[in-house]
């Protein structure tokens, strides 16, 4: 399966709308900062196979979708940038699936990937966490939505890599 | 390779403008927060702000509000610190470095080799 | 501003020896203390960040402890090029500050 270029290009608009949304100076959020544990392992191309760098891969979009589609999301974002950054979500989202059911076919998934799924999950739940434990306050929310940032641009590397292999 | 290169060394008299340089490479710019500290000679290392190339978004020290800014060209990852009017006390060497901003990664673990300003008449 | 405060400002040693620098916080800044080594006419260079994670590259001589207001930089075993300026930085909130440094010098 090849990701088309718009899969790309919308990863790139995702991040540039996440950039836009801040709504406060991430300056006064220095000692808000969290070890969240990025499972940097699993954006590492070279170790996959490619129906299993694709699920990763998805599942990250996925989890990133859902943490910004709950109603504490929606009270911490202008709703416009907002819903545009959903919208690119959920395209990548369609463009992902596809290519599972395809390479899903073509190579059996070891165990491996679901303890790769697994790891993303649970990165996702550590953020989630940490915003409870914090009870949603806008300085939180900055320092997830950079640790999004960052985690986006390691999918966006991995999809590089995908593409290489091709 | 990362990299912070600044620009060299300036010798210049009591009440001139400067605006010195720090240019990024081997990773993303935007991704990253620059940061200015100022060394007197002899002397220990002082914070004097910091920039968002991202948003061009900056915080800057109290002692050094309103004396100096600094700004970033976000198009050609750089960083820059200037001065309107320049006085001797401001005779130092300027270090640039990266922040990782709100992320969980190291402060400050890259620099640029600093650039002398003499400031004399 | 969270003051700094380094001891002691200098220290005499020989290769090999164990060194000790302590840094106080005037107020709580959790783990959030950085520590630099400075050789003249050089820039800065991180050794330790969070107050005890090793800086990439760093040799595992280098280790930092503490939390809250106190912290520590040890050198297990003094080495020829550990001679140098020892600085700790607070990154807990701005303005950044940092102590105003350690003299490590040839006994």
């Known amino acids: 399966c090849d990701l088309p270029q718009t899969h790309s290009l919308g990863n790139r608009r995702a991040l540039i709308l996440l950039g836009q949304m801040g709504r406060i100076s991430p300056f006064s959020c220095l000692k808000d900062r969290h070890d969240f544990r990025i499972p940097q392992e699993e954006f590492d191309g070279n170790q996959f196979q490619k129906a299993q760098a694709i699920s990763v891969l998805h599942e990250m979009i996925q989890q990133t979708f859902n943490l910004f589609s709950t109603e504490d999301s929606s009270a911490a974002w202008e709703q416009s940038l907002l819903e545009k950054f959903s919208t690119e979500l959920y395209q990548q989202l369609n463009d992902l699936e596809a290519c599972v059911i395809q390479e899903v076919g073509v190579e059996e998934t070891p165990l491996m990937n679901e303890d790769s799924i697994l790891a993303v999950r649970k990165y996702f739940q550590r953020i989630t966490l940490y915003l409870i434990e914090r009870k949603y306050s806008p300085c939180a929310w900055e320092v997830v939505r950079a640790e999004i940032m960052r985690s986006l641009s390691f999918s966006t590397n991995l999809q590089k890599r995908l593409r290489r292999k091709d | 390779e990362v990299q912070l290169v600044q620009s060299g060394a300036e010798v210049k008299k009591p009440g001139e403008s400067l605006k010195i340089s720090c240019k990024g490479s081997?990773?993303?710019?935007?991704?990253?927060?620059i940061g200015w500290v100022r060394q007197m000679p002899g002397k220990g290392l002082e914070w004097m702000g910091i920039i968002d190339p991202s948003d061009s978004d900056t915080a800057y020290s109290p002692s050094f509000q309103g004396q100096v800014t600094i700004s970033a060209d976000k198009s050609i990852s750089t960083a820059y610190l200037q001065w309107s009017s320049l006085k001797a006390s401001d005779t130092a060497m300027y270090y640039c470095?990266?922040?990782?901003?709100?992320?969980?990664?190291?402060?400050?673990?890259?620099w640029g080799q600093g650039t002398l300003v003499t400031v004399s008449s | 501003d969270i003051q700094m405060t380094q001891s002691p400002s200098s220290l005499s040693a020989s290769v090999g020896d164990r060194v000790t620098i302590t840094c106080r916080a005037s107020q709580s800044i959790d783990e959030f203390l950085n520590w630099y080594q400075q050789k003249p006419g050089k820039a800065p260079k991180l050794l330790i960040y969070f107050a005890s994670s090793l800086q990439s590259g760093v040799p595992s001589r280098f280790s930092g402890s503490g939390s809250g207001t106190d912290f520590t930089l040890t050198i297990s075993s003094l080495q020829p090029e550990d001679f140098a300026t020892y600085y700790c930085q607070q990154a807990h909130s701005f303005p950044l500050t940092f102590g105003q440094g350690t003299k490590v010098e040839i006994k």
């Open positions: 081997g990773y993303s710019f935007t991704s990253y927060w």
């Open positions: 470095a990266r922040h990782p901003g709100l992320n969980w990664a190291p402060d400050f673990d890259y």
